[in-house]
């Protein structure tokens, strides 16, 4: 009679996480009598997976009925596979004794577990940044196996190239994580922009996972200011407006100063939204000219999103004409926008009135 051989026909088996793994094992002889055991790994630290003779193995079932006469099939099924189950499994024949002794081992079957990556999480900088600045976004995904994975970055559908990606750990592991950092240059038009991290893996069957970050959470577009004098609305009154244009986010506080003294403070509430996602707002100030003997310096001061205030001034000349003539002095705009100005089309805004 030929000596018993333990046959493990599959060198490797790949299973998706959550599924069952079938590990095949047959023996070529009924001799010697003795149980089969399955181990993960070899050597003294090997882990017992199944023992035909004794023990409780809730995740393991035998594929064939091992009690049946002349049974030589000792294949097992392991349920609910996780990445932690990856490894090489050995089917080992034992010889009956006190205790049973190891007789012969199969060549082993390597079980690899295909585990899907977690949904990518994209995070941006802690503080907002202004256009023309470069900001970093990170993307993380965990728990995938095998190690091979592809990560791409997009901004509004356009693939980015300035990024660095690491997959950890470097050596063998039951599962892996990916971490990528991309650099993105902000523009004034980015309020509606999205940064997308896309992860492709063998477990996803060509349907990559995506994580997104809205640049509206990252960008700050500072306002441009323009102070103008409007035609007289009533005798001895001058109407001055402060146009606050193209700002984001909405959080904005405006203060009017007359000759350096605070006249009024208000918070932007009813704003108009531009197509690019930025906001416009307008504030009015009605100045009673007859109450002033000297020229008035009007300043529109804006604090946007907690940043240092920007301001724009307007000099209002008070003439010596008698009041009864009812003529208003022409105003001269001598101020300058400290942040620079642009020629943007403005949407209508709510007019705020204030009488002195």
């Amino acid at each position: 009679e030929e000596e018993l051989q333990v046959i493990q026909p599959d060198k490797s088996v790949s299973v998706a996480a959550g599924e069952s793994a079938i590990l095949h094992c047959t023996v070529t002889s009924l001799i010697p009598v003795g149980p089969i055991q399955w181990f993960r790994g070899a050597g003294p630290a090997r882990e017992l997976i199944y023992n035909q003779k004794e023990g409780h193995f809730p995740r393991v079932t035998t594929v064939s009925e091992s009690t049946k006469r002349e049974n030589m099939d000792f294949s097992i099924s392991i349920s609910n596979i996780t990445p932690a189950d990856a490894g090489t499994y050995y089917c080992v024949k034992f010889r009956k004794g006190s205790p049973d002794t190891e007789f012969k081992s199969g060549a082993g079957t390597e079980l690899s577990v295909r585990a899907k990556p977690s949904a990518p999480v994209v995070s941006g900088p802690a503080a907002r940044a202004t256009p023309q600045h470069t900001v970093s976004f990170t993307c993380e995904s965990h728990g995938f196996s095998p190690r091979d994975i592809t990560l791409k970055w997009f901004k509004n559908g356009n693939e980015l190239s300035d990024f660095q990606t690491n997959v950890d750990p470097v050596g063998e592991s039951v599962s892996y994580s990916i971490h990528s950092t991309a650099k993105v240059v902000l523009t004034r038009e980015d309020v509606h922009s999205q940064v997308i991290c896309e992860v492709a893996h063998v477990t996803l069957q060509g349907d990559p996972l995506r994580g997104t970050a809205n640049l509206s959470e990252t960008i700050r577009v500072p306002p441009t200011l323009e102070v103008t004098q409007q035609p007289v609305r009533a005798e001895n009154q001058v109407n001055v407006t402060c146009q606050v244009r193209k700002f984001y986010p909405q959080r904005l506080q405006l203060t009017w100063l007359e000759n350096g003294n605070v006249s009024r403070t208000e918070t932007a509430s009813t704003v108009t939204e531009n197509k690019d996602g930025t906001y416009n707002w307008m504030s009015w100030l009605l100045v009673n000219v007859s109450a002033h003997r000297d020229d008035v310096k009007l300043t529109c001061q804006v604090e946007h999103d907690g940043q240092p205030a920007v301001s724009k001034s307007h000099d209002l000349k008070v003439s010596a004409h008698p009041k009864e003539q009812g003529s208003n002095t022409a105003a001269e705009n001598t101020g300058s926008n400290e942040r620079g100005s642009s020629d943007y089309k403005d949407d209508d805004d709510k007019h705020h009135h204030h009488h002195h």
């Epitope: 009924l30 003795g34 149980p35 023992n51 035909q52 004794e54 009690t67 006469r69 002349e70 009956k96």
Partner: antibody, heavy 119, light 110 residues
């Protein structure tokens, strides 16, 4: 190690029934067949029947088919053999034995239960 | 049914001598490449003990002075050098079909 512990001796009257138990330990009860064998005083071994505790499949010696019933309780790893309509020639030591190789052989034996049938 | 006949019914052998017990089946017990014959030893007041399985394979812990041979219908249990502790009744059993035992052979010391 494998152990099969049998119930104590019984004295029965002709026509009665007896139920002998065999409690297994040291192995997974449902993975191996249990055989029942008897031996009358001064006589040879006589196979009665066998049971697979995993699914209660049984095989009986035709001689005992109508009088013997094998059962198992997997929750307590115990096998039972009931013999009905007892006669005086059923007086014997009744053994349970475990088949470790699914070869329909008897690898490990209990110590036996003496059943005496006498009026 | 297969009937097993052992011979002799009893046997007396001197210590250190060879003892041979025969078992003949009424039909072949060979199947699937195996001879489905088993040998047991039973000492007084004890349950039987498996010695040989599938005709020629010694069970664990069985001294190597015990050996089994044969094929088809004729089988032999041999004790190469009889020891005092070998005094017992020896049974053959077949399981090509359902188990049946031979009538037993009583081995004594001459």
């Amino acid at each position: 190690q494998v152990q099969l512990v049998q119930s104590g001796a019984e004295v029965k009257k002709p026509g009665a029934s007896v139920k002998v138990s065999c409690k297994a330990s040291g192995y997974t009860f449902t993975n191996y067949w249990i055989n029942w064998v008897r031996q009358a005083p001064g006589q040879g071994l006589e196979w009665i029947a066998m049971i697979d505790p995993s699914d209660s499949e049984t095989h009986y010696n035709q001689i005992f088919k109508d009088r013997a019933t094998l059962t198992t309780d997997t929750s307590t790893s115990t096998a039972y053999m009931e013999l009905r309509s007892l006669r005086s020639d059923d007086t014997a030591v009744y053994y349970c034995a475990m088949d470790y190789g699914s070869l329909y052989a008897m690898d490990y034996w209990g110590r036996g239960t003496l059943v005496t049938v006498s009026s | 049914d297969i009937v097993l006949t052992q011979s002799p019914d009893s046997l007396a052998v001197s210590l250190g001598e060879r003892a041979t017990i025969n078992c003949r089946a009424s039909q072949s017990v060979r199947s699937s490449g195996y001879n489905w014959i088993f040998w047991y030893q039973q000492k007084p007041g004890q349950p039987p003990k498996l010695l040989i399985y599938l005709a020629s394979n010694r069970d664990s812990g069985v001294p190597d002075r015990f050996s089994g041979s044969g094929s088809g219908t004729d089988f032999t249990l041999t004790i190469s050098s009889l020891q005092a502790e070998d005094v017992a009744v020896y049974y053959c059993q077949e399981s090509r079909e359902l188990p049946t035992f031979g009538q037993g052979t009583k081995l004594e010391i001459k």
